[in-house]
């Protein structure tokens, strides 16, 4: 299901297309850069490392898991000044649903 | 500059050199004499957007931090069973 | 060194097309996305597209939106900006640049005129 | 969308200093391009990234930026540096150009 990143409350919020937007399915957690970087050439680091192959906006990660793989995401490109952080922390389970 | 997330128990607390900032999301508490910010228990799924406070001069070194906690407390497994 | 070196610009009739080609060295072209700028008689700059660097992501201005095509072959270092149902309002000099936002680089312009 | 703000035009006298402004909301989050361009020539990048100059542009011309304003300096102005300056940041993808500064070197 789509668990894109809600305000809580009413204050002044940053704009949408600077928000990550994280999507779990099953096992499977794809989460997606800001979109702030039109059309650059995007980078990924996990925990300060660069991740190699990954240049899209989109990173995924098919058998996510809860121990290895939460962390600190960043993804940047040559022509932003900042780069935008993530602080992932997920459980994941292959048969679930998530009911509110 | 950067916020950073710690687990301390079952509680995710953000920390800065300077104070922690809410853009949106979930509110948290300011720890007293501190600068932390408490986000609650990880099992409420905090999310949300911070940063650390800095001065106008500096706040160009000061990014954004997004929170992302989905701990599947409300999974329900889908098997033969619950399908039918 | 760097070298952006833009054609393709003519006298074009409105309603017709065009291809701009911008043929790139100096550089490991596939590593930087490509952009074109135009800047219209005695007016401003205005970013018209831009493409990632494998041509995956573009981006166009609203006013050309449906009109215009940017490519590039990375075998060629060559980007192009395909450009069909030409309006008055596309006179302009295009000029290709390196990079995608902080562009270090622009070529010398072709010049696109449309009237009829 | 984002906006730039520049004066539409500054006065230098010959070899002394020039600075020209570009007023953005927070614009020290962005990176900051100027952009040289002489009457009847292509423009041409002097400064990419705030501050650095591309090869083969001369040291007199620097950049700054932080809060809500960035700046170009030209120290020791020359005849040759009459022309008119834009601004550019790349915001959400699309670049964002200032309307331009026309700057007149005073003999």
């Known amino acids: 299901q789509d668990e894109d990143f809600k305000a809580s409350d009413d204050l002044t919020s940053i704009s949408p297309e600077k928000r990550f937007k994280v999507s779990i399915s099953g096992t499977e957690v794809v989460v997606t850069c800001p979109d702030v970087f039109g059309y650059d050439n995007i980078k990924w680091e996990k925990n300060d490392n660069l991740v190699e192959g990954a240049s899209n906006r989109e990173l995924s990660q098919k058998e996510f898991s809860e121990v290895d793989d939460s962390g600190y995401y960043a993804c940047y490109a040559d022509s932003i000044k900042e780069k935008s952080y993530l602080y992932l922390r997920a459980r994941v389970c292959a048969n679930c649903i998530e009911v509110n | 500059f950067k916020v950073s997330v710690e687990e301390l128990e079952d509680r995710v607390f953000l920390s800065c050199n300077t104070s922690v900032l809410r853009i949106e999301g979930t509110m948290g508490i300011q720890l007293p004499h501190s600068r932390t910010l408490d986000l609650g228990k990880r099992i409420l799924d905090p999310r949300g957007i911070y940063r650390c406070n800095a001065t106008e001069e500096q706040s160009d070194k000061a990014p954004y931090m997004q929170v992302y906690y989905r701990m599947c407390q409300n999974c329900v497994e889908l098997n033969s069973a619950t399908l039918a | 060194e760097v070298q952006l070196v833009e054609s393709g610009g003519d006298l074009v009739k409105p309603a017709g097309s065009l291809r701009l080609s911008c043929v790139a060295s100096g550089f490991t072209f596939s590593d930087y996305s490509m952009s074109w700028v135009r800047q219209a008689p005695e007016k401003g700059l205005q970013l018209v597209a831009g493409i990632n660097g494998d041509g995956s992501t573009t981006y166009y201005t609203d006013a050309v939106k449906g009109r215009f095509t940017i490519s590039r072959d990375n075998a060629k270092n060559t980007v192009y900006l395909q450009m069909n149902s030409l309006r008055a309002e596309d006179t302009a000099m295009y000029y290709c640049?390196?990079?995608?936002?902080?562009?270090?680089?622009w070529g010398q312009g072709t010049l696109v005129t449309v009237s009829s | 969308s984002y906006e730039l703000t520049q004066p539409p035009s500054v006065n230098v006298t010959l070899r002394e200093t020039a600075h020209i402004t570009c007023g953005g909301a927070s614009i020290g989050r962005k990176y900051v391009q100027w952009i040289q361009q002489i009457p009847g020539q292509a423009p041409v990048v002097i400064i990419y990234k705030d501050s650095n100059r591309p090869t083969g542009i001369p040291e007199r011309f620097s950049g700054a930026n932080s809060g809500n304003t960035a700046t170009l300096t030209i120290s020791g102005a020359l005849a040759e540096d009459e022309a008119d300056y834009y601004c550019?940041?790349?915001?959400?993808?699309?670049?964002?150009f200032g309307e331009g500064t026309q700057l007149t070197v005073l003999r």
């Open positions: 640049a390196k990079g995608a936002g902080t562009g270090d680089f």
């Open positions: 550019q940041v790349g915001d959400s993808g699309a670049w964002v």
